[in-house]
Interface confidence: low
């Protein structure tokens, strides 16, 4: 489901599929 994160933004159920670098372990950059 949807979750509210600590910054007050609503995160979709598939948010963790968004590969990015800064803190995403699923990303390929580090």
């Amino acid at each position: 489901g949807w979750t509210l994160n600590s910054a007050g933004y609503l995160l979709g159920p598939h948010a963790v599929g968004n590969h990015r670098s800064f803190s995403d372990k699923n990303g390929l950059t580090s």
Epitope: H19, R20, D24, T29, S30
Partner: antibody
Framework: EVQLVQSGAEVKKPGATVKISCKVS????????MHWVQQAPGKGLEWMGR????????IYDPKFQGRVTITADTSTNTAYLDLSSLRSEDTAVYYC??????WGQGTLVTVSS | DVVMTQSPLSLPVTLGQPASISCRSS???????????LEWYQQRPGQSPMSLIY???NRFSGVPDRFSGSGSGTDFTLKITRVEAEDVGVYYC?????????FGGGTKVEIK
């Protein structure tokens, strides 16, 4: 609800070491990289390094290498930042962060004799 | 290290008007995997930073669509179509393609 709760403000003398904790709830830290970012008073953001809590692998900005150690305890879902040989220019707010917009509230470290 | 240079340093804007922030990298931040890990962060006064944009142009869930990111290679832009009072703060670009990861110096958005 996702929360990253950092330990309280610290006042340290030059040459000392400070250890800051970042207690996480709402997700397992081993599923994400955990990063630390420095912000000196009135200044911008500086990336310090990150850890993969699953295996303890770390990478650091060479600027901080040797004085910074990032660790994580998956049993308590907590990340830590150790900064040693403190000097006045280390006076700053330190943030822990993970992906998808989540940052801790920041910990002010003041280095003063 | 990759140096991220933002301009302007300060951006006074009128409510309801557009705003644009530039970020240039000292070298290409296209990663070897083909992606460009350029991100934008907002820091409201007295608050922790918040993520707005990842991979140049992708908005995080919940980020208003008045924010948009664009660019490629070494030249990137954050645009706010109509500035609202809650948009006041400092905006940082960030590259996560090359270690050490680096932030731009920040652009302070204020209301005229």
């Amino acid at each position: 609800e996702v929360q990253l709760v950092q330990s309280g403000a610290e006042v340290k003398k030059p040459g000392a070491t400070v250890k800051i904790s970042c207690k996480v709830s709402g997700f397992n830290i081993e599923d994400y990289y955990m990063h630390w970012v420095q912000q000196a008073p009135g200044k911008g953001l500086e990336w310090m390094g990150r850890i993969d809590p699953e295996n303890g692998n770390t990478i650091y900005d060479p600027k901080f290498q040797g004085r910074v150690t990032i660790t994580a305890d998956t049993s308590t879902n907590t990340a830590y930042l150790d900064l040693s040989s403190l000097r006045s220019e280390d006076t700053a707010v330190y943030y822990c962060a993970r992906g998808y917009v989540d940052w801790g509230q920041g910990t002010l470290v003041t280095v003063s004799s | 290290d990759v140096v991220m240079t933002q301009s302007p340093l300060s951006l006074p804007v009128t409510l309801g008007q557009p705003a644009s922030i530039s970020c240039r990298s000292s070298q290409s931040i296209v990663h070897s995997d083909g992606d460009t890990y350029l991100e934008w962060y907002q820091q409201r006064p007295g608050q922790s930073p918040m993520s707005l944009i990842y991979k140049v142009s992708n908005r995080f869930s919940g980020v208003p669509d008045r924010f948009s990111g664009s660019g490629s290679g070494t030249d990137f832009t954050l645009k706010i179509t109509r500035v609202e009072a809650e948009d006041v703060g400092v905006y940082y670009c960030f590259q996560g393609s090359h270690v050490p990861y680096t932030f731009g110096g920040g652009t302070k958005v204020e209301i005229k």
